[in-house]
Amino acid sequence: GIAIPRNSGCPNSEDKNFPRTVMVNLNIHNRNTSTNPKRSSDYYNRSTSPWNLHRNEDPERYPSVIWEAKCRHLGCVKADGNVDYHMNSVPIQQEILVLRREPRHCPNSFRLEKILVSVGCTCVTPIVHHVA
Amino acid sequence: GIAIPRNSGCPNSEDKNFPRTVMVNLNIHNRNTSTNPKRSSDYYNRSTSPWNLHRNEDPERYPSVIWEAKCRHLGCVKADGNVDYHMNSVPIQQEILVLRREPRHCPNSFRLEKILVSVGCTCVTPIVHHVA
């Protein structure tokens, strides 16, 4: 194992892979202020690159439910409500950490996993490739 | 502990709060293809609501480094490069899970925590409040 000075009050770990295997308390602490207005926004509808949200479920993952964004249009919505195909709606993606049951169906054993999720969409100027 | 039919190959847990406290392997499995172009995109520059990325560091958190988006403008960038203040650049926020060392400074004991991060920005039509 790795020589780490034992802090009094810290749980012990006899695991041979210590500290690669750790104890995690799943009682989630919420750091967010409950009144944060940005969390309850309707940007998905008001954006020039609007998106729909889809419920992605995986019972072997924690959290088992993740909402994924899918852009509604290839182009971006103009002030008159029409779609401008000279611009592109693209998903903003983020890598997030989830817990994956490992071995499968085990109730108390997980492995950290990085997954890529689409959080919303933004409107970008397309990259124009000029042919010589 | 709680009487649960033991799945062969599952680690044991004698923790009284089981299954709220679980074992987690920190050797991250990456589900994402490393060549995914969206992850290395320059949307932050090409967006009509461009953003800058700021490094948020916390040694008591896992991952210790999280990149946060901050919109560059209040308005949105038009085709001519000028900012249109009749539209708004707003951050797209997402709740993500991180591991927080608990008790503090303990190397092998964590608690799940939900934090709100800004992933990028999108351009939205403002909500106009009409005064009677």
Partner: antibody, heavy 119, light 107 residues
């Protein structure tokens, strides 16, 4: 404390539509999913679908896809379920319930709305 | 979809008796099972989540156990106020499904 207050009993004619409501209080409405469930004496409890008021996303049980439409109004912290083309088969008690998306379980239920479809 | 078979449908017991209700899932649902108590004229109340975790404020006479497909709910010493319908629900995956319920009556 958390409460889900559902609208009162409804008596409607076959072929009509009805909109049931579920008003949330005691928590941030946008943070949690609201699910809807149908209860009949014959078939017991059946899951209809879910709406996430924070992001507008919905998902439905295929059996109810053409029957129910879920919406939410964040300004009044109220979730709605509209049932269309009603028949006697839709007569039931309908419940809303709150789902903790991260934790993965349902913790609070409404008191139920009794819908009777009859001519 | 996953079928949750709950037994028995009815229970007639005396105060002080021990009561056991079972739910069997048609496929493994890990420990993603909850038990609820539904009293007449009230909202259903969560008693047990994660198959065996007693929810906040629930008296310790209520217990749950099981993993995979077989789940048990027990009231160690029935009290008069426990008169209700009890049902299980799997929250392993949608469509979320329910047991048929057990009506508990006190002699």
């Amino acid at each position: 404390q958390v409460q889900l207050q559902q609208s009162g009993a409804e008596l409607v004619r076959p072929g009509a539509s009805v909109k049931l409501s579920c008003k949330a209080s005691g928590y941030t409405f946008s943070d949690y999913e609201i699910h809807w469930v149908k209860q009949t004496p014959v078939h017991g409890l059946a899951w209809i679908g879910v709406i996430h008021p924070g992001n507008g996303g919905t998902a439905y049980n295929q059996k109810f896809k053409d029957k129910a439409t879920l919406t939410a109004d964040k300004s009044s912290s109220t979730a709605y379920m509209e049932l269309s083309s009603l028949t006697s088969e839709d007569s039931a008690v309908y419940y809303c319930e709150r789902f903790l998306t991260y934790e993965g379980y349902f913790d609070y239920w409404g008191q139920g709305t009794t819908l009777t479809v009859s001519s | 979809s996953i079928v949750m078979t709950q037994t028995p449908k009815f229970l007639l017991v005396s105060a002080g008796d021990r009561v056991t209700i079972t739910c069997k899932a048609s496929q493994s649902v890990n420990n993603d099972v909850a038990w609820y108590q539904h009293k007449p004229g009230q909202s259903p109340k969560l008693l047990i989540n994660y198959a065996s975790n007693r929810y906040t404020g629930v008296p310790d006479r209520f217990t749950g156990s099981g993993y995979g497909t077989d789940f048990t709910f027990t009231i160690s010493t029935v009290q008069a106020e426990d008169l209700a319908i009890y049902f299980c629900q799997q929250d392993y995956g949608s469509p979320y499904t329910f047991g048929g319920g057990t009506k508990l009556e006190i002699k």
